[in-house]
Amino acid sequence: IVLRPSRVHNSEENTMRALTLKDILNGTFSYKTFFPNWISGQEYLHQSADNNIVLYNIETGQSYTILSNRTMKSVNASNYGLSPDRQFVYLESDYSKLWRYSYTATYYIYDLSNGEFVRGNELPRPIQYLCWSPVGSKLAYVYQNNIYLKQRPGDPPFQITFNGRENKIFNGIPDWVYEEEMLATKYALWWSPNGKFLAYAEFNDTDIPVIAYSYYGDEQYPRTINIPYPKAGAKNPVVRIFIIDTTYPAYVGPQEVPVPAMIASSDYYFSWLTWVTDERVCLQWLKRVQNVSVLSICDFREDWQTWDCPKTQEHIEESRTGWAGGFFVSTPVFSYDAISYYKIFSDKDGYKHIHYIKDTVENAIQITSGKWEAINIFRVTQDSLFYSSNEFEEYPGRRNIYRISIGSYPPSKKCVTCHLRKERCQYYTASFSDYAKYYALVCYGPGIPISTLHDGRTDQEIKILEENKELENALKNIQLPKEEIKKLEVDEITLWYKMILPPQFDRSKKYPLLIQVYGGPCSQSVRSVFAVNWISYLASKEGMVIALVDGRGTAFQGDKLLYAVYRKLGVYEVEDQITAVRKFIEMGFIDEKRIAIWGWSYGGYVSSLALASGTGLFKCGIAVAPVSSWEYYASVYTERFMGLPTKDDNLEHYKNSTVMARAEYFRNVDYLLIHGTADDNVHFQNSAQIAKALVNAQVDFQAMWYSDQNHGLSGLSTNHLYTHMTHFLKQCFSLSD
């Protein structure tokens, strides 16, 4: 059990107060993390509280300002990037968000040697992406869907691509679906390790159907937003990968990297690019039916100035029980011989583990094993491999950092974090300097987050980077809910759950229950992390019990649980939430007449289906920006788990798994449906169709739309949303205002 105490430091309990909704909406109890911006093995940059950019040297213990807040303010910079040769800094301003990762900005180059901005050949605006080369101070940037190169910031640019066109051809940046569902980045270009070559993707969206929605704004007529967006079964983007020599870019121009024959024979995706050396690159490809992935290692042929990808350097990863990989296919981490690599994929027992591939995948050497999963490989050095897993004490919702000594035989394993701050810290990530000389650990909970700096050889803690002292003090007089993480064993399935209990919880009393669900494939909600959020308030102030349950389809507990939902979305995720609720009722402290469920996005889909399950368990529920039919969602995501919506594939389940098909079943529940009209991700269409089906079935329901808001419902909409949902739940549970 992980309990978060109420922290009663004062004998007079009346000095303690419950959380308020205002606390949550104001972000009163938000925490800070510290991720060093590493610039060498022993130096990092950090933006100070007063906005100076400060260089810290761990070994000398010295720090000094390299860029003043005055310079930052002179161009209203909100971000910066130091060139690897330390000559220049780019300053980023006029940030304008596009989709989840993408944004445009204005960039200024500041010369640190002279203490002034570079004049002449200034960068155009707005720029879609800009980055330094890994060595020196070359610049690559994307402007109006074309890629440009500068040898030095003051030089005129060299235009690499010319065919870029809004919503048609994207060079060096992903289109909507690649950004959201495949790359999870705003960029699609990659420098080779020493900056000799630049690789980039070209996405051709010419034939993709367009989603169009109104953006109301303030004008007399609304604008129409058009996004090439392939829904399940629709025409997909066509991707090509090119590499250009940045030293002599005009010599032969961009050279296309060949696609493996077994991939090119039908629709396919490019999934990632990893440079190995300046003249060796690794590309990963995926069939449209996403159970076959090919990793292809390609070499530069000096004589022909082309890239050669021999079949002997093709490694196939295939899943027979589900899709390839977890959420994404994992990426390789190459070792110093520049041909062998480490990679996470399923072992014979169906658990994701680290494997070492020297020649073929069939001959892979398994590095980790057990009924737990390796989650991320952080760094491979000559003698150590650092990774995270959920092995420790068999809690799948924890993350600890491990070091495997690969320089010695047999390799020895050490948990770096397991016993550091055991009660406070059970969920870590890490950030490594060059050669893993030093690293930062960022602990997310279950206690108050803390960031620390460590020696990469001894693992010794050097200093605390951020310990959230102010937050700790602010929470001293707050009655926080108690949290426990436990598991239910039901029909050979383990259902881990997190229960958030009111501060004065008494097992002999009855409490209203709210289920918070996400439940999407390869997600995890039950995590040992710190949070003071809306559900904390509902437990603290309103006396609700809140539960989160990880059912079938969720991650990091083996392929049996993960792939259980393959081709059957909307069935087992819902069943497992219902099963858990029945178990919670059996515990004796739940008022079974006051049970609600809510979720956002995939969670909105699951909560809607749970409400319409006909069990009579739920009195009410909320769906925020739900998917309502898998035919409405993005091809890359949907087809990964559902196959194609065609008669000879999986159309029947596409049709059976809609929320609309269950409209009649909403008659006996109170349903609140919420969506942003400018949702580029889960289109408003989804909720429009639910509403239409409910109206056609003459079923009463409540709804709220947020004009011109996207999938995140940010800004003032957030406050309105949570206030509205609070009123709805309090009314449902007969709680006084």
């Epitope: 070994e59 300002t65 860029l67």
Partner: nanobody, 116 residues
């Protein structure tokens, strides 16, 4: 405040060599990352070479393969060995932190003149 004293400049013929030194005082700790910079007449100051506290070096493209930066932590001194000098290397050479600190703290530099 750190004091920087550059020396070793002079007049040399094209193809010749020079070794510049930079004595760092006022700093008790080990040397931070240090760099050499230069300013030619009528031009802006530019970075030439850098060495970090782990002795990892980096060079501007126009001097790569000809110049070598090194350091002696015991003497708190940074060096720049300049070989195969060209007339375009003529400039006042400065040493400083790499990158320089704010506000900048430049020494008086040392003049290098390369005749053809």
């Amino acid at each position: 405040q750190v004091q920087l004293q550059e020396s070793g400049g002079g007049l040399v013929q094209a193809g010749g060599s020079l070794r510049l030194s930079c004595a760092v005082s006022g700093s008790t700790a080990r040397l931070d990352a240090m760099g050499w910079y230069r300013q030619a007449p009528g031009k802006q100051r530019e970075w030439v070479a850098g060495i970090d506290s782990a002795d990892i070096t980096d060079y501007a493209r126009f001097v790569k393969g000809r110049f070598t930066i090194s350091r002696d932590n015991a003497k708190n001194t940074v060096y720049l060995q300049m070989n195969s000098l060209k007339p375009e290397d003529t400039a006042v050479y400065y040493c400083n932190k790499w990158p320089p600190s704010v506000p900048p703290n430049w020494g008086q530099g040392t003049q290098v003149t390369v005749s053809s």
